[in-house]
Amino acid sequence: VLPRWRQQWSGSGTTSRFPETVLARCVKYTEVHPEMRHVDCQSVWDAFKGAFISKYPCNITEEDYQPLVKLGTQTVPCNKTLLWSRIKDLAHQFTQVQRDMFTLEDMLLGYLADDLTWCGEFNTFEINYQSCPDWRKDCSNNPVSVFWKTVSRRFAETACGVVHVMLNGSRSKIFDKNSTFGSVEVHNLQPEKVQALEAWVIHGGREDSRDLCQDPTIKELESIISKRNIRFFCKNIYRPDKFLQCVKNPEDSSCLSGI
C-alpha cells in the first residue's frame, strides 16, 4: 500500500504530544486558578481540535476559534493588562513576580498554546506532525497565526483602565506595526474602556542612557493611540535586571533611585 500523499509545508510540524500537552496544561491551569474551576478541559480540547482538524490549514478563520474563545472566556481586572512585543520572556518574568498583572499567556487560552505549533489536514482527522504552514513562506491564515490573532484581539478588546505594554528597546523598530501588538492589539483597545496606554521601553545595553521614548517608532505609536482617544505615556526601563529585582523587593534602598 502506497503511503497517502501529505501536504509539505515550510514550517515545523505539530509539537509532539500536542493533544496531551493541551489537556495537561488545561487541567493544571484550572487547578491553580479557582475562577476557572468550572472549565471542562475535555470540552476545551474538543473546541481546540475542532478549530483546525479536517480543515485546510491555509484557510483557517477567526470563526473557527469562536467555540474555544467562548469556553475560555476570562476577564482581567482593570489596570492589570500587560501587553508585550518582542520581549516575551521579561514580560512573563514580570507577571510571575507581580502576580496581579496578566499577559495573554497568563490567561487560559494563551497558557494552553504558548510555544506550541499545530495543524491538521483537509478532510482527515489526523494531526500533521511533519510540517505546518509558515506565516511568510506558505500562508498567514494558518491555525497558529489565526489563533494568536483571535485571542490577542479578544485580550485587547476586554482590557480596561490603564493598559501597559512592554517593548524591546534593543530592536531597530521598538514599535513594529507588523507585530501582533502593532497590527492587532493596538487597534482593538476600546477607547470607552481604556483610559491610557503606558509603554515601558526596555533597554538592552547597560550603558544605554538614551531616552528611547523619543524614538520615531514610539512617536508613531503615540500618534496611533492618541488618534483613538486613548492617552499615551512612555517610560524608559534602563536596567531590566534591577527593574525585576525592585518589583520583587520594592523596599530595597537601591530601588529608590531610577531604574
Epitope: A47, G50, Q66, L71
Partner: antibody, heavy 120, light 111 residues
Framework: EVQLLESGGGLVQPGGSLRLSCPAS????????MTWVRQAPGKGLEWVST????????WYADSVRGRFTISRDNSKNTLYLQMNSLRAEDTAVYYC???????????????WGQGTTVTV | QSALTQPPSASGTPGQRVTISCSGS????????VSWYQQLPGTAPKLLIY???QRPSGVPDRFSGSKSGTSASLAISGLQSEDEADYYC????????????FGGGTKLTVL
C-alpha cells in the same frame, strides 16, 4: 428519526416557577450543545440559554440571568430549563434546539422541537 | 432592539430573486459564523444556512448565504409561494456573558 419534544409549559402567576423538559431521541445527545430559544406572541426569536455537551458551561440572555437555569441529564437524554421568578414578559413559546456538535463542524441550531407555551 | 438588524419585510413575485440582509458589528457577525432560519406560519424554525454559506441536506439550492465584514445576506432565487415565511439570521455574540444573537426577522411575502 431525530426528535426534540418540549413539555412543562402552562399558565403560571407572576413570581411563580416552571420547569421545562426536552427529551431527545434519534441522535447522540451527549455530543451536542443544546439551546433554549423563545418567541413572544407576534414577536421574533429570542435566544434564552445554551449549555455545552458535557453540561460544564452555560450562557444566559441578560433578560433571564439569575432567574433561569439550564441543565441536562445525558443519561436520560434530556434538556431542562428551570424558570423562577417568572414575569409577564416571559410569556412565549419556548423551543429547545440541538446546537453545535462537539466536533465543532458547524455552529447552528439544526434541529428544533415543536415548542411549549408558557403564559405568565 | 435586536443586535442584528434585518429589514422587517421583503417581497417578490414567483420566479424572482430576493435578498434579505442582516447587519451586525465587529462583536458578532464579523468574527462568527452566521446561520439563517425559516419559520413558516405556526411552525418551529428550520435551519436553512449554517457557517455563512453551507446548506443542510434537504434545503434546496435556491437558498444561498454570504457574508462580508459585519453583514450577511440570504438570497432566494426562483421564488415560490411556499417560501412565504419569516426569516431570521443568527450568529454568536462576542460579549463575555452571551452566546447567540438573532436578527429581528424579515417577513417575506410572495406576491
Amino acid at each position: 428519526e431525530v426528535q426534540l419534544l418540549e413539555s412543562g409549559g402552562g399558565l403560571v402567576q407572576p413570581g411563580g416557577s416552571l420547569r421545562l423538559s426536552c427529551p431527545a431521541s434519534g441522535f447522540d445527545f451527549s455530543s451536542y450543545w443544546m439551546t433554549w430559544v423563545r418567541q413572544a406572541p407576534g414577536k421574533g426569536l429570542e435566544w434564552v440559554s445554551t449549555i455545552t455537551d458535557s453540561g460544564g458551561r452555560a450562557w444566559y440572555a441578560d433578560s433571564v440571568r439569575g432567574r433561569f437555569t439550564i441543565s441536562r441529564d445525558n443519561s436520560k437524554n434530556t434538556l431542562y430549563l428551570q424558570m423562577n421568578s417568572l414575569r409577564a414578559e416571559d410569556t412565549a413559546v419556548y423551543y429547545c434546539a440541538r446546537d453545535t456538535p462537539k466536533t465543532y463542524y458547524y455552529y447552528a441550531m439544526d434541529v428544533w422541537g415543536q415548542g411549549t407555551t408558557v403564559t405568565v | 432592539q435586536s443586535a442584528l438588524t434585518q429589514p422587517p419585510s421583503a417581497s417578490g413575485t414567483p420566479g424572482q430573486r430576493v435578498t434579505i440582509s442582516c447587519s451586525g458589528s465587529s462583536s458578532n457577525i464579523q468574527y462568527s459564523y452566521v446561520s439563517w432560519y425559516q419559520q413558516l406560519p405556526g411552525t418551529a424554525p428550520k435551519l436553512l444556512i449554517y457557517n455563512n454559506v453551507q446548506r443542510p441536506s434537504g434545503v434546496p439550492d435556491r437558498f444561498s448565504g454570504s457574508k462580508s465584514g459585519t453583514s450577511a445576506s440570504l438570497a432566494i432565487s426562483g421564488l415560490q409561494s411556499e417560501d412565504e415565511a419569516d426569516y431570521y439570521c443568527a450568529t454568536w455574540d462576542e460579549s463575555l456573558l452571551g452566546l447567540w444573537v438573532f436578527g429581528g426577522g424579515t417577513k417575506l411575502t410572495v406576491l
